[in-house]
């Protein structure tokens, strides 16, 4: 995502003024002696190395040599204080100190930014023993330096519970600008201003920013990092990037697409999943959201009937799931259904309309003039009724359902009988004597069972009694 010009490339002479010092890599030329160890010191003897005494953290030995003169204060010799180098170069630096031979177990440790460097670092300590002192050179090398190697390095040595600390060696790894904040893709409202941010760091500093929109530079002069670009508004999609320049060259951010929010595309593939007499379950595939989340959808339903007034029923629903059960429809009717969805910008066009039908409904009225007689000789109950006046939408009558409930002395049981559509009378066997029989009848179509008639009760006496119950509902005109 990040493209980098080569370090040598300086395509745009942006930066007047003094340049940082030339690259320094090998500041110390270490003698190749056999007495070396990887971080593990060993006392040996060799001539003292000359060096300017360090006046900071100094250990002053109390021991006298030859019983008379005091030993000089112990201090690390001064070395290079600041090393500037390019990324991926190698660097080696060292600390040196001369230690009187009276001290045993001298260990030099390396520290970076206050933390001890342990483990697999390229630290080598060399010893040059002499009669009275041992010169110790601790070197630290880094191959192919990275920005993370930037920092302040010091040597520490412990002698007699005293700690001697070297001057810091500051390593500055320079390279192409490194982005800490890049512009982000956004979806924006048409002709509305918005901001983009770009931030890059060195070293070397300063880092200067150029903004690029659709391959054209927005600012012809650089802006110091961090830079905020106020885009005055867009009418169409645009691609933005920023260029970060420093003395090493330039780094280009990822290009980000800024999209313009628009009304959504209409939904597609409206499908019927299930139809009942009074409801239809539909689903749809949402169209493109116009770079703005869907808020809700609208299901539009028109009855397809030459006699209907052509009005549209509108049902609002959430944008997801992409499914809706349309209710309160008429049975056995044809409908045209379309779906539209909205985002913050507005409503989409309506999807292609699809046709759907509801199934037959159940009857809406109960059979009329229900009468119940006890036929003692046959030990059954005779039931008669009149066919209900059903609407077309209820579909074709397929029969009747008779409910008879027998109640006596705390016992109650309901039985159901089905009879064909051509019948308007039925006989049921007496189930219990000295009991009440309650009869209700409902018409049945393919769409289901209609409402039951009002209950008609008849008392079934012990043998020898006769009773007659009037009809449950008077026939029209028989008032």
């Amino acid at each position: 995502a990040i493209t980098e010009a080569r370090e040598e490339a300086k395509p745009y002479p942006l930066f007047p003024g003094p340049l940082p010092g030339s690259l320094q890599t090998d500041h110390t030329s270490l003698l190749s002696l056999p007495h070396t160890s990887g971080y593990q010191p060993a006392l040996m003897f060799s001539p003292t190395q000359p060096g300017r005494p360090y006046t900071g953290n100094v250990a002053i030995p109390r021991v006298t040599s030859a019983g008379s003169k005091l030993l000089p204060p112990l201090a690390f010799k001064h070395t290079v204080g600041h090393i500037i180098l390019s990324e991926h170069k190698d660097v080696k630096f060292n600390c040196s100190i001369s230690v009187p031979n009276i001290y045993q177990d001298t260990t030099i440790s390396w520290w970076k930014d206050g933390k001890e460097l342990l483990g697999a670092h390229h630290a080598i300590t060399q010893f040059y023993p002499d009669d009275e002192v041992t010169a110790i050179i601790a070197s630290f090398s880094i191959t192919s330096v990275q920005r993370s190697d930037n920092g302040s390095y010091i040597c520490k040595m412990k002698i007699n519970n005293e700690e001697i600390v070297s001057d810091p060696i500051y390593i500055e790894v320079q390279g192409l600008p490194h982005f800490t904040k890049q512009p982000e893709s956004m979806n924006v409202t048409r002709n509305t201003a918005f901001n983009l941010t770009c931030q890059a760091v060195g070293p070397p500093e300063p880092v200067n920013i150029f903004w690029v929109q659709n391959s054209s530079r927005v600012n012809e002069q650089p802006e110091k990092s961090p830079s905020v670009l106020t885009v005055p508004g867009l009418t169409e999609m645009a691609v933005f990037s920023c260029e970060a320049h420093n003395d090493k060259g330039l780094t280009v951010s990822k290009g980000v697409q800024i999209n313009i929010k628009a009304i959504p595309s209409p939904p597609t593939e409206v499908s019927i999943h299930n139809s009942t007499a009074h409801s239809i379950l539909i689903s749809w595939v949402p169209g493109f959201d116009g770079y703005s989340p869907f808020r809700n959808c609208s299901v539009q339903v028109k009855e397809v009937d030459p006699l209907s007034n052509g009005s549209v029923m509108i049902f609002n629903t959430s944008a997801s799931p992409h499914m809706y059960q349309i209710k309160q429809l008429q049975a056995l009717a044809n409908y045209s259904i379309g779906v539209s969805c909205m985002n913050e910008i507005g409503w989409s066009a309506v999807s292609p309309w699809i046709l759907a039908s509801t199934t037959e409904g159940a009857p809406s009225v109960a059979p009329l003039n229900v009468t119940v007689f006890l036929n003692e000789s046959r030990d059954n109950v005779d039931i008669r009724w009149m066919k209900p006046l059903t609407k077309r939408q209820a579909g074709e009558l397929v029969g009747y359902r008779i409910s008879h409930v027998w109640q006596s002395a705390g016992i109650s049981k309901e039985l159901l009988e089905e009879v064909g559509q051509n019948n308007s009378r039925a006989q049921i066997s007496v189930q219990v004597h000295n009991a009440t029989c309650t009869v209700r009848i409902a018409a049945v179509t393919k769409g289901g069972v209609g409402p039951f008639s009002d209950p008609v009760k008849i008392f079934i006496p012990a043998h020898g009694w006769v009773d007659h119950a009037p009809s449950s509902t008077p026939a029209p005109g028989n008032a």
């Epitope: 002479p13 007047p16 002069q221 508004g233």
Partner: antibody
Framework: QIQLVQSGPELKKPGETVKISCKAS????????MNWVKQAPGKGLKWMGW????????TYADDFKGRFAFSLETSASTAYLQINNLKNEDLATYFC???????????WGQGTLVTVSA | QIVLSQSPAILSASPGEKVTMTCRAS?????MHWYQQKSGSSPKPWIY???NLASGVPARFSGSGSGTSYSLTISRVEAEDAATYFC?????????FGAGTKLELK
């Protein structure tokens, strides 16, 4: 407040050289490039090019390459337009204007009329 | 280079009238700026980046457009609006200006 103040009118003969100044105040001079725009009498505006006030690098529109030179005196926050070997068609008012984002010329000098007459 | 064609060259209007002037580009541009210039003065920044009014510009001015077609509209012209209006494109070097539309009041 930001101001661009240009030098006064110039009357020159063909073949001579003229140098117009544009002194900026009210902002950091090196933050914005400086454009030069030509307007012949009764005509429209024509962009001549610009100078990067940070680096001093000039950019010239094709019609203004050769006899025209943009320069700076950064310490004095001043930009200059020099026209060498003046011709009759150089008779015009020359404007300096700051270069903002999207090449928006937010601030203009009052203009310098250069008359070329034998 | 992109050529900007402004029309009409001269626009005559009565105070209170609504007027629109257009600027067509020979190729698509990202933004159009507009400047107002009165006789003997330097151009004044008027509309920035297609539709943003510069500081101090009355709200009766508006700008719109995209691609190759841009316009400046004055909802109710006033006497002080008499001037020449120049468009200038951003998006392709060299920067170019239109020849101007001169608004005259009847």
């Amino acid at each position: 407040q930001i101001q661009l103040v240009q030098s006064g009118p110039e009357l020159k003969k063909p073949g001579e050289t003229v140098k117009i100044s544009c002194k900026a105040s009210g902002y950091t001079f090196t933050n914005y490039g400086m454009n030069w725009v030509k307007q012949a009498p009764g005509k429209g505006l024509k962009w001549m090019g610009w100078i990067n006030t940070y680096t001093g690098e000039p950019t010239y529109a094709d019609d203004f390459k050769g006899r025209f030179a943009f320069s700076l005196e950064t310490s004095a926050s001043t930009a200059y337009l020099q026209i060498n070997n003046l011709k009759n068609e150089d008779l015009a008012t020359y404007f300096c204007a700051t270069y903002g984002h999207y090449a928006w010329f937010a601030y203009w000098g009052q203009g310098t009329l250069v008359t070329v007459s034998a | 280079q992109i050529v900007l064609s402004q029309s009409p060259a001269i626009l005559s209007a009565s105070p209170g009238e609504k007027v629109t002037m257009t600027c067509r580009a020979s190729s698509s541009v990202s933004y159009m700026h507009w400047y107002q210039q009165k006789s003997g003065s330097s151009p004044k920044p008027w509309i920035y980046a297609t539709s943003n009014l510069a500081s101090g510009v009355p709200a009766r001015f508006s700008g719109s457009g995209s691609g190759t077609s841009y316009s400046l509209t004055i909802s109710r012209v006033e006497a002080e609006d008499a001037a020449t209006y120049f468009c200038q494109q951003w998006g392709t070097k060299p920067l170019t200006f239109g020849a101007g539309t001169k608004l005259e009041l009847k």
